[in-house]
């Protein structure tokens, strides 16, 4: 009932709480003397359902039979309405729609860990709208059962509180659920377990890694687990890896011996402990562990190139290049690295140790057969040299690759092709693909950049610090014994007109014609390799068409000559540059008047 | 300090019921573990039944065969055993004990003597035939 319900009542058959689908009896009736003053007969109740009528009737009571009410809770009001008077409310009751509880399912209890306690979960089926209570009871050894009750309002786990010890690891116990409400009640099936059943132990914890003698091939890891595990199973990763590697161990007594872990490598690792071989379940995986390996000395072998320029009739400049090992190969960190320089025939040697660099320049005479040993060294040794006889490697023209190419393949990738030399193919060894910026001063500062590739190969995909819009000088080398042959081309990956074109810097007068000189378009301009110059002229104040003269594009040509130039006319002069995609905009512009005799 | 006594006891037939109070002093039950145990004459004392008054987990000897349950009112710091269906061989000086509730107990603990620190004087109950 909602209220005091001084006027009359509200009765409800057969229950205020029913199973959905039934049908309720309500009744309203007034107390004696309750009804509308001086006119009894007039009394009109009226039903509410919340705020909605759905009956009303003349006299002392009313009945309403009620069908299809939903689950949950509905409030049924009663009034009275009387001539030139609101409705006064009489009482009312609320009905409560819901179903028996269903059977609980899945019931499984689990203890965590030797010292944890026994906790229960189950899935309580459909909601059954009403105030429902759970009951858990846990039967076991010596006659025991214990019992516990749930009022939570959605109730599917339950702790007891009891810690179940190994005294008798195999003794059964049984777990069931009951549910219970004012429709009905329904017990889960019962759970039978042993106590290594439902110990799900701790994860381990402290967990420690030794290197005997710095050597990563005599590591042990160190755990501490609760006192009954049998099994542990361990897992670990490289840092930058998503795989796992797996081992399980039984009786490990929280120690074990890795095998194959790799030199200089930050690893992750995790154990995981179970009681019985069959019985129970893993525990959760331990807080990982992070540790770097220590170092080995390293494998494998640089790659080494390099580039002579001709200084003086006597000299010239050796540039040595080298590419880092692969982690896996350095197996630590390079301190440095070790460049020695020999004279084959004189015995002279020199060894230099270079650090923070993969580059080594120095100048040597232009007589004599020289090599190059380079190798790399970590705190634990140093990786077999690389040896290198220095050669002219373009000497040998008849090595020459032939038809070399080179055409953008996707974004930032060119692709270099071309045909073997004309002599003897199966003489070449291996092809080098050189490619670097081109810079018009040629300058040797600019990083180098090549890939090796099979004798068989005649094409090379180059991506390795390779820009947009920039123009490389790539070189095709063929190599043979101590002899090599080259070709050259110009490529870029993408291109577009360049920005600006060329600034002529002078306009000189020499017998009859002029010699036109410009800077070149700054590189980031160039958006590209260069094809061609255009220079065009024309008179001033002409509205003529202006002449032209196209120049292919070559690194270092930076003068011109024009020779059909009027005397004593004044022309207005400018420049062009032109990409594969397009043409600059002008240069700056100049007016030269030609002092000449007229012809 | 808590005191217990007990109370209800008496001569009744077999097939009778009865119900034995025990009411705490000196300190509420509201963090205790709360047993029942008998003790007929020339045998040791056994477990009834327990109660942890604060999560409403009770602990029961199925031997009984659930003819013994536990009941309590808050109000009166008093915990009942209404006893059912009794039977001659349910003779005994029945004695209630209290422990201040540990973290967790184990499966059997409730059940020793031992494991409780305050105990009633007893009060007798004969079942005759």
């Known amino acids: 009932k909602i209220d005091a319900c001084k006027r009359g009542d509200v009765t409800v058959k057969p229950s205020h709480v029913i199973l959905l689908g039934s049908t309720v009896n309500i009744t309203c009736s007034l107390k004696p003397r309750q009804g509308c003053f001086h006119y009894s007969r007039r009394n009109k109740l009226i039903l509410y359902k919340f705020d909605r009528r759905i009956n009303f009737h003349h006299g002392h009571s009313l009945n309403s039979q009620v069908t299809g009410l939903p689950l949950g809770t509905t409030l049924f009001v009663c009034k009275l309405a009387c001539i030139n008077s609101d409705e006064i409310q009489i009482c009312g009751a609320e009905i409560f729609v819901g179903v028996a509880p269903e059977q609980p399912q899945n019931l499984s209890c689990i203890q965590k860990g030797e010292q944890g306690t026994v906790a229960c979960t189950w899935e309580r089926g459909r909601d059954t709208h009403l105030y429902t209570e759970y009951t858990l009871q846990l039967s076991g050894p010596k006659n025991l059962t214990w019992q516990k009750q749930c009022k939570d309002i959605y109730c599917d786990y339950l702790d007891f509180g009891i810690n179940l010890t190994p005294e008798s690891p195999e003794s059964n116990f049984t777990a069931k659920v009951t549910a219970v409400n004012s429709l009905g009640s329904s017990s889960s099936l019962p759970s039978t377990f042993t106590f290594l059943d439902i110990v799900r132990p701790l994860p381990p914890w402290d967990i420690r890694i030794k290197f005997q003698k710095a050597s990563v091939s005599r590591c042990t890891l160190y755990w501490r687990d609760e006192g009954l595990v049998l099994l542990n199973r361990l897992r670990y990763r490289p840092s930058n890896s998503r795989l796992w590697n797996m081992v399980n161990v039984t009786k490990a007594k929280g120690r074990h011996d890795l095998l194959d872990l790799k030199p200089f490598t930050e690893y992750e690792f995790q154990i995981s402990s179970k009681l019985h071989l069959y019985k129970g379940s893993w525990s959760d995986w331990s807080e990982s562990l992070r540790a770097q390996t220590p170092e080995e000395e390293p494998t494998g072998m640089l790659d080494v190139w390099y580039m002579k320029r001709h200084i003086d009739y006597s000299r010239q400049q050796i540039s040595l290049f080298w590419k880092n090992l692969s982690v896996s190969e350095a197996r630590g960190k390079i301190l440095h690295y070790q460049v020695t320089l020999q004279e084959l025939t004189g015995g002279k040697a020199m060894t230099q140790n270079i650090t923070g660099h993969t580059s080594w320049t120095t100048v040597i005479p232009r007589t004599g057969n020289w090599a190059v040993a380079v190798s790399a060294a970590n705190s634990k040794g140093s990786s077999l040299p690389t040896r290198i006889n220095i050669m002219n490697l373009c000497e040998a023209g008849l090595l020459a690759p032939r038809q070399v190419s080179a055409n953008s393949e996707g974004m930032d990738n060119i692709l270099v092709t071309w045909q073997p030399p004309r002599k003897d193919p199966s003489a070449v060894q291996e092809y080098v693909v050189e490619w670097r910026e081109l810079h018009p001063g040629g300058d040797t500062q600019v990083p180098l950049n090549w890939l090796r590739s099979r004798p068989y190969n005649v094409s090379a995909l180059i991506s390795e610090n390779i820009k947009s819009y920039i123009c490389y000088e790539i070189r095709v080398y063929a190599l043979s014994g101590d002899q090599g042959g080259c070709s050259s081309i110009l490529g870029n990956s993408k291109h577009k007109a360049p920005l600006s074109g060329p600034h002529i810097n002078a306009i000189t007068e020499e017998k009859g014609s002029i010699l036109i000189s410009w800077n070149s378009i700054p590189v980031q301009e160039q958006m590209g390799c260069l094809l061609h110059y255009r220079i065009y002229w024309k008179e001033r104040d002409s509205n003529s068409q202006p002449q032209l003269c196209e120049i292919p594009y070559r690194v270092s040509q930076n003068s011109h000559p024009i020779n059909s130039l009027q005397p004593r006319v004044t022309y207005v002069l400018w420049m062009t540059a032109l990409t594969a995609a397009g043409e600059s905009s002008h240069g700056n512009e100049r007016e030269f008047c030609l002092q000449g005799k007229a012809n | 300090q808590v005191q217990l006594q007990e109370s209800g006891g008496g001569l009744v037939q077999a097939g009778d019921s009865l119900r034995l109070s025990c009411a705490a002093s000196g300190r509420t039950f509201d963090t205790y573990i709360v047993g029942w145990f008998r003790q007929a004459p020339g045998k040791e004392r056994e477990f009834v039944s327990a109660l942890s008054w604060s999560d409403d987990t009770t602990i029961r000897d199925d031997s009984l065969r659930g003819r013994f349950t536990l009941s309590r009112d808050n109000a009166k710091n008093t915990v009942y055993l209404l006893m059912n269906s009794l039977k001659p061989e349910d003779t005994a000086v029945y004695y209630c004990?209290?422990?201040?509730?540990?973290?967790?107990?184990?499966?059997?603990?409730?059940?020793?003597?031992?494991?409780?620190?305050?105990w009633g004087q007893g009060t007798q109950v004969t079942v005759s035939s």
């Open positions: 004990a209290a422990k201040a509730k540990p973290p967790a107990a184990t499966w059997s603990s409730y059940r020793n003597r031992e494991w409780y620190d305050y």
